[in-house]
């Protein structure tokens, strides 16, 4: 199904305009900002979501130490260029002709340059580390129950195949979710780890992208899990190229 047939909406992306003008009068939805037709049975690519967002009106530890090449999205929001499949174009430029190269999740991976800057290929982000801090609770969550709950969430809510959730680490109050997905592992139809991480981040911030679904209500054996801080690290298949340590 492309979209909810009964009332013609997109369950997986509320930043769309839908109408029954698809083949055979079927509901078809297009992303705001780009007008690209989206598949409402799966997550929409982060590039199209970011474009839609920019077009909308403004208003001895078990924890993983991020690799020295890990990127954090410090640049914030920008209006991206997406390819016809909705992926980020390798080179992004702003209105003042400042350009830079990005990875598959749209995070800058080079110094900024001018229009002569070349970005030969879109480098894949194959490892994402989601670092969360939960609000104080009476006691620590059971690690196994927390682990299973987060794996279930990524399967059920984001449709991410279980093989791509590499690990869940917990050292109260810090939770780390590791997502891994090499180019060779990703089959047609598989949700991209970058898209799953983006939907999760928006859910955690109370800015759910889903249409007509309640916000994220995370519970571990009935105990609410409330996230108070999120930091996401991105590791690319090829290390980033910056002229100096950031």
């Amino acid at each position: 199904h492309t979209a909810a047939q009964d009332n013609c909406t997109c369950p997986t992306n509320k930043m769309t305009v839908c109408s029954p003008d698809g083949p055979g009068g079927r509901c078809q939805c297009r992303a705001l900002g780009s007008g690209v037709a989206v598949d409402c049975s799966t997550l929409t690519s982060e590039c199209l979501l970011l474009k839609a967002r920019m077009s909308a009106p403004k208003n001895a530890r078990t924890l993983v130490r991020p690799n020295e090449h890990a990127l954090v999205d410090n640049d914030g929001l920008y209006d991206p260029d997406c390819d016809p499949e909705g992926r980020f174009k390798a080179r992004q430029c702003n209105q003042t002709s400042v350009c830079w190269c990005v990875n598959s999740v749209g995070v800058r991976r080079t110094d900024k340059g001018d229009l002569s800057l070349r970005c030969d290929e879109l480098v894949r982000t194959h490892h994402i580390l989601i670092d969360l801090r939960h609000r104080p609770t009476a006691g620590a969550f059971n690690h196994s129950d927390l682990d299973a709950e987060l794996r279930r969430l990524f399967r059920e809510r984001y449709r991410l195949h279980p093989k791509f959730v590499a690990a869940v680490h917990y050292e109260q109050p810090t939770i780390q979710i590791e997502l891994r997905q090499n180019t060779s592992q990703k089959a047609a139809g598989d949700v991209d780890i970058g898209d799953a991480a983006y939907y999760f981040e928006r859910d955690v911030k109370g800015e759910s992208l889903f249409q007509g679904r309640g916000g994220l209500d995370l519970r571990v054996r009935g105990e609410p899990l409330q996230v108070e801080r999120t930091l996401i690290y991105y590791l690319d298949e090829i290390p980033p190229k910056f002229s100096m340590k950031r």
Partner: antibody, heavy 117, light 106 residues
């Protein structure tokens, strides 16, 4: 072809334990989840829990916690479910089922466990 | 736990009839799944994500609904459709099933 082949029927006495096996083929074992569901005679389906085969992460329902143990042997692509302190109410057909981005997409043929003195 | 209540519990119908089975959840769920089970056999996935037919399932089956109310419809009953049908949710642990609807020949 995806297949889940379960072990044969078992008859056990109250208080004993039973271990049901589920041998998988036709897919990469460690990429998936195996869930366990039971069905008492003439009754509906009841979920017991699941094991993530790649990480060994397990979730048991509250009702079975403490009495059930789920394991997996990746070398033989076999998942196991052991239920201890058996009582007559545990008489049921026990199913294993594969999970992916669906809760259960392929099912084993079922194993009848009879608990009788 | 999310309770799922199916209605009716049993149903007698004839070949060619249109049949509707409902599943009501005690709290909102994202999607509903439907399974068909024949005597002595394992359940078979029929519908996933509320309305998408599983591979090989005939188009006479359809699913709809949202929130707490979901429906399975068989537009024109065939002899092989007489079976027991279960709804199931996995929006939260533990996964739960409806009590089942037994569809019998009138």
């Amino acid at each position: 072809e995806v297949q889940l082949v379960q072990s044969g029927p078992e008859v056990k006495k109250p208080g004993a334990s039973v271990k049901v096996s589920c041998k998988a083929s036709g897919f990469t074992f460690t990429d998936y989840v195996i869930g366990w569901v039971r069905q008492a005679p003439g009754q509906g389906l009841e979920w017991i829990g699941e094991i993530y085969l790649g990480s060994g992460t397990i979730y048991y329902t509250e009702k079975f916690k403490g009495r059930v143990t789920m394991t997996a042997d990746t070398s033989t692509s076999t998942a196991y479910m052991e239920l201890s302190s058996l009582r007559s109410e545990d008489t049921a057909v026990y199913y294993c089922a594969r999970g992916s981005i669906f809760p259960f997409d392929y099912w084993g043929q079922g194993t009848l466990v009879t608990v009788s003195s | 736990d999310i309770q799922l209540t199916q209605s009716p519990s049993s149903l007698s119908a004839s070949v060619g009839d249109r049949v509707t089975i409902t599943c009501s959840a005690s709290s909102s769920v994202s999607y509903m799944y439907w399974y068909q089970q024949k005597p002595g056999k394992a359940p078979k996935l029929l519908i996933y994500d509320t309305s998408t037919l599983a591979s090989g399932v005939p188009s006479r089956f359809s699913g709809s609904g949202s929130g707490t109310d979901f429906t399975l419809t068989i537009s024109s009953l065939q002899p092989e459709d007489f079976a027991t049908y279960y709804c199931q949710q996995w929006s939260s642990y533990p996964y739960t099933f409806g009590q089942g609807t037994k569809l019998e020949i009138k």
